[in-house]
C-alpha cells in the first residue's frame, strides 16, 4: 500500500480580517493510526493550533467528523481571523508511540495571509493659520492594515500634488502597519473653499480608496483690503463717509472710526456678505456733522481682523 | 486496500468578485487510474470545467502538478471570479475505459457563492421644487450586488425615515441583484441645508454601509415673505422706503417698484445676504420725491421668485 | 479476510514461561497497534500492554512490568506476548486485538483467544 | 490510573426492554469511550468507539452517548441475541482500563 501522505493543497490563503479562514488537510491512507494535529509555524518554536486528542481550541472547528473511523479530511476553520494569526499552518500527522506519539508525516503548509483593512485616514492641518502665498503642511495617518503594501497621493481640489513624503511603518515584518504622510500647501487668496484629500488605496477596499479631506478655511488668513470714500451729501451741513472692508476670512473683525486721532466708534461686524471665494466683504458708514468742525478732519477706519495687528486707512474730509 | 475516495473538505466556498477560487480536492488512492474532470453542477446539463486530459481552461490552473506521478491532490484555482461563477462544483474520478473513459466516484461538491458588492448607490430627488409642507420623492438604485441579501435605510439628516418602498430585483435566483427603493420626505422651511441619505449594507461591504445623498436645496422652493416700511426722513421733500425680502430659495428673484400702479424701477437681486438656514434675504429702497405728489401715493413691491407667479406688498405714503 | 489466528493453548507450571503469537492477515500489519487483554475465570478484561507494529514501541501494565514482554515480527505479520515467572493468578485466556483509534485506543478486530493455565 | 465505574453490575431485561447501561470515568477522558459485547467463551466485540460512534456491521439499536466522565450504552429494543456481558473501556491514555462489565439477563 502507498504511504500515507498529508495533502495541503492550497500554498496560500488569504483572508479578511473579521473572517474564518479554512485550512485544506487530507491524508490518502487510514494508517498508520494516530492522531493529527495543525500547528503554525515549524520547528521548536510552533505554535499548536489543534490537536484531534485534547485540548480545548475554542476558535478551531472541524470540517468532518475526526472521530469517524474511516476520516480522511483534516481540515479546519479558524474563526474571527486577526492580523496577529498570519503565518504558516502545518497538518500533521502522528503515529502512536510510547510513551508519546511520535510525528510521522506533515503536509507542505499553507501560509495564511490576512486582509486587514487601513482605518478612516485623519488629516490634521497646521496648528495656526497663514496667509495667502505662505507653504502650510498637512498630515494624514491611518493604522492597522495589511498586507505593508498601500498607495498614498494628496489632491487639492481635483489636482494631485507632489511635494509630500510618507512612511509605512514598521519597516519590517509585522501583523499590520500603520502609514503617516506629510504634504506640503502653498495657499492662495481663493482658497477658503478648497479642500485638501489624502487618498489611500489598498487590496482590501476592492477599488474604493479611503479618503480623508481638511478644509484650507481652516488653516488660511486672508486679511482685508480697506477702501474710505465719500458719499453724495445726504442734507446740508452732514457728511456720509464709508469704509469698504474687502475680501476677508474668517468673520471676526472690529471696526473703529477715529476722528482727528480720537476714537469716535467701535462696531463688531456682524451681517457680512459672502463672496463667491468663501471670503466676506462688510461696510461702515460715519455720519458727520460739520457744523461741529471749523478745519478739516481726518477720518480713520481702523479694523483689527482674527486677533491680528490693526490695518487703517485715513480720509481727509475738507471742511468748505 | 480501501477503496478510492474522492475527499472536498469544503461544503463551501465564498469568495468575492475579481478574486481567484480554490476548489479542494484530493484523492486517497493513485488507482484506479484515469483522469479527474471537474464539473459545475450535475447530472445531464453539468458543465465541465477542468479536465485534466485534454482542453484549454484559460481561468483554471491546478494547485499541484497532475503530471506527477503520485500526485493525489486535485485541487484548482480559477481565477478573476464573476457572479455568475456561483454554483456547485464536483471533482470527478474517471477510470481508463473504452472507448471513453468512466466515471468512478464523485467528491460531494463545493458550493462557489460569489459576493459582489453592490454599485455607489445613486440617489435623484424630484424634477420640480415643491414648498415647504409638501411631500417630495427621492429614488436610491444599486446594481450587480450578490449574495440578495441587502439592507436599505433612509435618512434625512441624521434621523431615519420610515415611509419609504424597497425592492429588490429579480426575485428568483439570480447571478447578481439590483435595488431600488422611493422615500417620501415632508418639506421643512429649515430643508436648504438637509440632506437625504440612502444607506446600504450588504455581506461584501465589511460592516462600511454605502451611502448616496442628495441635497434637498436642489428640490426646495422656499417662497420670500416681503414687508415696506418707511424709513426717518433723511431730507425735506424725501421719502424712503425699504422693501425687505426675507428668508427665499433658491437665489434667482426680480422685484420691480410701482407708484400708483406705474412701474417705477425693476432690479434683480444680486449681493445676497445668506441666513444660517441657507435661506437669502435682500432689501431694495425707493427714494420718492414728495414734491411730484400732491395726492398720498400707493407704493408697491413686486416680487418674481424663481420663476413663480408674482407677490406684492403695497405701502401707502401720505403726502402731507 | 482480515483476521487475528492465536496459537493454541498451553498448561505451565509456576514459575515458567509461555510465549502467544497472534498471526495478523488482511490488512497492512505495521498500519495498527497490538494490545494483549487477559480474561481469568469469571472474571472481567484486564489490559495487559500495547505494542506499535510499525516501530516496536511497548507500553506494559504496572503490575506485569519485569515480567511481559511483547515483540513483533513484521516479515510475518505476527505478534508475540511472552509472560515470564508464572504463577496461578496468571490461569487466564490471553487474547490479542487491533487497535484501530486514531486520537484514542479502541479495539476493533480481537483473536479467538489462547488459555494459558498454570497448575502444578 | 484512570478507574472505570459500570452500573449496575448485572440487569435482567426482557426482550423488546430498553436496556440503559452507565459508566464513569474518574477523571475527563474526552469523548474516547468503547464499548463491547462479550458472549461465554468468545472474545469481546466492539460495538461503540469514541463514546457514540456505531462501529461498521453493529445494529443500530446499539447506540451510545456522553463525553468526560459520564457514558450511557443504550440498547432500545433489546433482542435474543444481545443477551451478554458489556464493557465500557476508556482510551484515552495508558494503561487502559475496563469497567467491570454488566451482564445482561433473560427476566
Known amino acids: 500500500e502507498d504511504e500515507l501522505q498529508v495533502i495541503q493543497p492550497e500554498k496560500s490563503v488569504s483572508v479578511a480580517a473579521g473572517e474564518s479562514a479554512t485550512l485544506c488537510c487530507a491524508m490518502t491512507s487510514l494508517i498508520p493510526v494516530g492522531p493529527i494535529m495543525w500547528f503554525r509555524g515549524a520547528g521548536a518554536g510552533r505554535e499548536l493550533i489543534y490537536n484531534q486528542k485534547e485540548g480545548h481550541f475554542p476558535r478551531v472547528t472541524t470540517v468532518s467528523e475526526l472521530t469517524k473511523r474511516n476520516n480522511l479530511d483534516f481540515s479546519i476553520s479558524i474563526s474571527n481571523i486577526t492580523p496577529a494569526d498570519a503565518g504558516t499552518y502545518y497538518c500533521v500527522k502522528f503515529r502512536k508511540g510510547s510513551p508519546d506519539d511520535v510525528e510521522f508525516k506533515s503536509g507542505a503548509g499553507t501560509e495564511l495571509s490576512v486582509r486587514a483593512k487601513p482605518s478612516a485616514p485623519v488629516v490634521s492641518g497646521p496648528a495656526v493659520r497663514a496667509t495667502p502665498e505662505h507653504t502650510v503642511s498637512f498630515t494624514c495617518e491611518s493604522h492597522g492594515f495589511s498586507p505593508r503594501d498601500i498607495t498614498l497621493k494628496w489632491f487639492k481640489n481635483g489636482n494631485e500634488l507632489s511635494d509630500f513624503q510618507t512612511n509605512v511603518d514598521p519597516a519590517g515584518d509585522s501583523v499590520s502597519y500603520s502609514i503617516h504622510s506629510t504634504a506640503r500647501v502653498v495657499l492662495t487668496r481663493g482658497d477658503v473653499h478648497s479642500q485638501v484629500i489624502c487618498e489611500m488605496a489598498h487590496i482590501t477596499l476592492q477599488g474604493d480608496p479611503l479618503r480623508g479631506t481638511a478644509n484650507l478655511s481652516e488653516a488660511i488668513r486672508v486679511p482685508p483690503t480697506l477702501e474710505v470714500t465719500q458719499q453724495p451729501m445726504r442734507a446740508e451741513n452732514q457728511a456720509n463717509v464709508t469704509c469698504q472692508v474687502s475680501n476677508f476670512y474668517p468673520r471676526g473683525l472690529q471696526l473703529t472710526w477715529l476722528e482727528n486721532g480720537n476714537v469716535s466708534r467701535t462696531e463688531t461686524a456682524s451681517t457680512l456678505i459672502e463672496n463667491k471665494d468663501g471670503t466676506y466683504n462688510w461696510m461702515s458708514w460715519l455720519l458727520v456733522n460739520t457744523c461741529a468742525h471749523r478745519d478739516d478732519v481726518v477720518l480713520t477706519c481702523q479694523v483689527e481682523h482674527d486677533g491680528q495687528q490693526a490695518v487703517s486707512k485715513s480720509y481727509a474730509l475738507e471742511i468748505s | 486496500e480501501d477503496e478510492l475516495q474522492v475527499i472536498q473538505p469544503e461544503k463551501s466556498v465564498s469568495v468575492a468578485a475579481g478574486e481567484s477560487a480554490t476548489l479542494c480536492c484530493a484523492m486517497t488512492s493513485l488507482i484506479p487510474v484515469g483522469p479527474i474532470m471537474w464539473f459545475r453542477g450535475a447530472g445531464a446539463g453539468r458543465e465541465l470545467i477542468y479536465n485534466q486530459k485534454e482542453g484549454h481552461f484559460p481561468r483554471v490552473t491546478t494547485v499541484s502538478e497532475l503530471t506527477k506521478r503520485n500526485n493525489l491532490d486535485f485541487s484548482i484555482s480559477i481565477s478573476n471570479i464573476t457572479p455568475a461563477d456561483a454554483g456547485t462544483y464536483y471533482c470527478v474520478k474517471f477510470r481508463k475505459g473504452s472507448p471513453d473513459d468512466v466515471e468512478f466516484k464523485s467528491g460531494a461538491g463545493t458550493e462557489l457563492s460569489v459576493r459582489a458588492k453592490p454599485s455607489a448607490p445613486v440617489v435623484s430627488g424630484p424634477a420640480v421644487r415643491a414648498t415647504p409642507e409638501h411631500t417630495v420623492s427621492f429614488t436610491c438604485e444599486s446594481h450587480g450586488f450578490s449574495p440578495r441579501d441587502i439592507t436599505l435605510k433612509w435618512f434625512k439628516n441624521g434621523n431615519e425615515l420610515s415611509d419609504f418602498q424597497t425592492n429588490v430585483d429579480p426575485a428568483g435566483d439570480s447571478v447578481s441583484y439590483s435595488i431600488h427603493s422611493t422615500a417620501r420626505v415632508v418639506l421643512t422651511r429649515g430643508d436648504v441645508h438637509s440632506q437625504v441619505i440612502c444607506e446600504m449594507a450588504h455581506i461584501t461591504l465589511q460592516g462600511d454601509p454605502l451611502r448616496g445623498t442628495a441635497n434637498l436645496s436642489e428640490a426646495i422652493r422656499v417662497p420670500p415673505t416681503l414687508e415696506v416700511t418707511q424709513q426717518p426722513m433723511r431730507a425735506e421733500n424725501q421719502a424712503n422706503v425699504t422693501c425687505q425680502v426675507s428668508n427665499f430659495y433658491p437665489r434667482g428673484l426680480q422685484l420691480t417698484w410701482l407708484e400708483n400702479g406705474n412701474v417705477s424701477r425693476t432690479e434683480t437681486a444680486s449681493t445676497l445676504i445668506e441666513n444660517k438656514d441657507g435661506t437669502y434675504n435682500w432689501m431694495s429702497w425707493l427714494l420718492v420725491n414728495t414734491c411730484a405728489h400732491r395726492d398720498d401715493v400707493v407704493l408697491t413691491c413686486q416680487v418674481e421668485h424663481d420663476g413663480q407667479q408674482a407677490v406684492s406688498k403695497s405701502y401707502a405714503l401720505e403726502i402731507s | 479476510q482480515v483476521q487475528l489466528v492465536q496459537s493454541g493453548a498451553e498448561v505451565k507450571k509456576p514459575g515458567a514461561s509461555v510465549k502467544v503469537s497472534c498471526k495478523a492477515s488482511?490488512?497492512?500489519?505495521?498500519?495498527?497497534?497490538i494490545v494483549w487483554v487477559r480474561q481469568a475465570p469469571g472474571q472481567g478484561l484486564e489490559w495487559m500492554g500495547w505494542?506499535?507494529?510499525?516501530?516496536?514501541?511497548?507500553n506494559y501494565a504496572q503490575k506485569l512490568q519485569g515480567r511481559v514482554t511483547m515483540t513483533t515480527d513484521t516479515s510475518t505479520s505476527t505478534a508475540y506476548m511472552e509472560l515470564r515467572s508464572l504463577r496461578s493468578d496468571d490461569t487466564a485466556v490471553y487474547y490479542c486485538?487491533?487497535?484501530?483509534?486514531?486520537?484514542?485506543?479502541?479495539?476493533?478486530?480481537w483473536g479467538r483467544g489462547t488459555l494459558v493455565t498454570v497448575s502444578s | 490510573d484512570i478507574q472505570m465505574t459500570q452500573s449496575p453490575s448485572s440487569v435482567s431485561a426482557s426482550v423488546g426492554d430498553r436496556v440503559t447501561i452507565t459508566c464513569r470515568a474518574s477523571?475527563?477522558?474526552?469523548?474516547?469511550l468503547a464499548w463491547y459485547q462479550q458472549k461465554p467463551g468468545k472474545a469481546p466485540k466492539l460495538l461503540i468507539y469514541?463514546?457514540?460512534n456505531l462501529q461498521s456491521g453493529v445494529p443500530s439499536r446499539f447506540s451510545g452517548s456522553g463525553s468526560g466522565t459520564d457514558f450511557t450504552l443504550t440498547i432500545s429494543s433489546l433482542q435474543p441475541e444481545d443477551f451478554a456481558t458489556y464493557y465500557c473501556?476508556?482510551?484515552?491514555?495508558?494503561?487502559?482500563?475496563f469497567g467491570g462489565g454488566t451482564k445482561v439477563e433473560i427476566k
Open positions: 469514541a463514546a457514540s
Open positions: 505494542i506499535s507494529a510499525y516501530a516496536g514501541e511497548t
Open positions: 477523571q475527563g477522558i474526552s469523548s474516547w
Open positions: 486485538a487491533r487497535e484501530a483509534g486514531s486520537s484514542w485506543y479502541d479495539f476493533d478486530l
Open positions: 488482511g490488512y497492512t500489519f505495521t498500519g495498527y497497534g
Open positions: 473501556q476508556q482510551g484515552a491514555s495508558f494503561p487502559i482500563t
